[in-house]
Amino acid sequence: ATKLTEEKYELKEGQTLDVKCDYTLEKFASSQKAWQIIRDGEMPKTLACTERPSKNSHPVQVGRIILEDYHDHGLLRVRMVNLQVEDSGLYQCVIYQPPKEPHMLFDRIRLVVTKGFSGTPGSNENSTQNVYKIPPTTTKALCPLYTSPRTVTQAPPKSTADVSTPDSEINLTNVTDIIRVPVFN
């Protein structure tokens, strides 16, 4: 089995997590995709999902989560806006393929949200609704209730030994384990 890897993103309250999950275009383009959180000792919990069948480049907003599935590029974009400390955790993208188990996409995202000061350079996009100008989508195609019964095992972060080109955006602690994310004032 492929070893699950994770990327660590360290952000401040009010900022936006903006990530992508890639998938095999020919196989999963119109499949329903979901964003899940994995809590220690629990089964993954689905927080948001695309419509079924998934619509191309059509943003689906569930609370502070916005999903956009770019069929023609084989990419699911996930944004979590106005982050809160309690959003910290391990996340993953999955593709629903009933009756089979959901297909997990790499990488998993280890999100660490720390306290920030509103209105300072460490803060970002404090207003959820005005930021993206996306009319809230009432997701009629509800997310399937089942979750993967697999045992949740956490792999260590990938080696980032040769990572170069630092992008100076956020004060970081351990650069080898953390993805640097831009601060938008």
């Epitope: 990327e7 480049s57 990938k158 080109t165």
Partner: antibody, heavy 122, light 107 residues
């Protein structure tokens, strides 16, 4: 040394295919997307598509769909871009460029190959 | 697709001048904008990412600003080695598109 080294210039006939290689060194190849950008003589930059070297998944713009194939060999840190059914308007310099981390929506290209000139002529 | 319109398409300035190039997006791209410099016969080189962040190793005379649909790229004091074509590029959604370029010459 962090760099992308591309294969040499090619001359092809209309209808043929070309496969351009891009060898990465000095960084972890599987951690960053590889993008392909082309530039016709005296023209601007045109993004063709991307590839995640870790998963092997890729995507391209509608214009090239069905004609472009992006692959990689992780054991030797090489990305490939193959363009088929060549026509004269495909004559251009083809660049590979490193994108952001594979999981990040950061589409900036901070490292470029020198480019490969592909000439399509009968 | 989002269209990126740069202006002017070409300009001529003297060494020491302040040079400004603008990039207009056809829709709101927030700060998802990068600037590149391309010297004749060379590959492009990233100068500014996320609208205003200076890439490592790039001289501080280069700067960027803007948000939404209007962006500005500035060279505070033009140097002879700045002769090049400059491009903006958005990544607010896919496909990624570049501006048509601004060719900068020295008077």
């Amino acid at each position: 040394q962090v760099q992308l080294v591309q294969s040499g210039a090619e001359v092809k006939k209309p209808g043929a295919s070309v496969k351009v290689s891009c060898k990465a060194s000095g960084y972890t190849f599987t951690r960053y997307d590889i993008n392909w950008v082309r530039q016709a003589t005296g023209q601007g930059l045109e993004w063709m598509g991307w590839m995640n070297p870790q998963s092997g998944n890729s995507g391209s713009v509608q214009k090239f769909r069905g004609r472009v194939t992006m692959t990689r060999d992780t054991s030797i840190h090489i990305a490939y871009m193959e363009l088929s059914s060549l026509r004269s308007e495909d004559t251009a310099v083809y660049y590979c460029a490193r994108g952001g981390y594979t999981s990040s929506w950061r589409w900036y290209f901070d490292l470029w190959g020198r480019g490969t000139l592909v000439t399509v002529s009968s | 697709d989002i269209q990126m319109t740069q202006s002017p398409s070409s300009l001529s300035a003297s060494v020491g001048d302040r040079v400004t190039i603008t990039c207009q997006a056809s829709q709101d791209i927030r700060k998802h904008l990068n600037w590149y410099q391309q010297k004749p016969g060379k590959a492009p080189n990233l100068l500014i990412y996320d609208a205003a962040n200076l890439e490592t190793g790039v001289p501080s005379r280069f700067s960027g600003s803007g948000s939404g649909t209007a962006f500005t790229f500035t060279i505070s004091s033009l140097q002879p080695e700045d002769i090049a074509t400059y491009y903006c590029q958005h990544y607010a959604n896919l496909p990624i598109t570049f501006g048509q370029g601004t060719r900068l010459e020295i008077k």
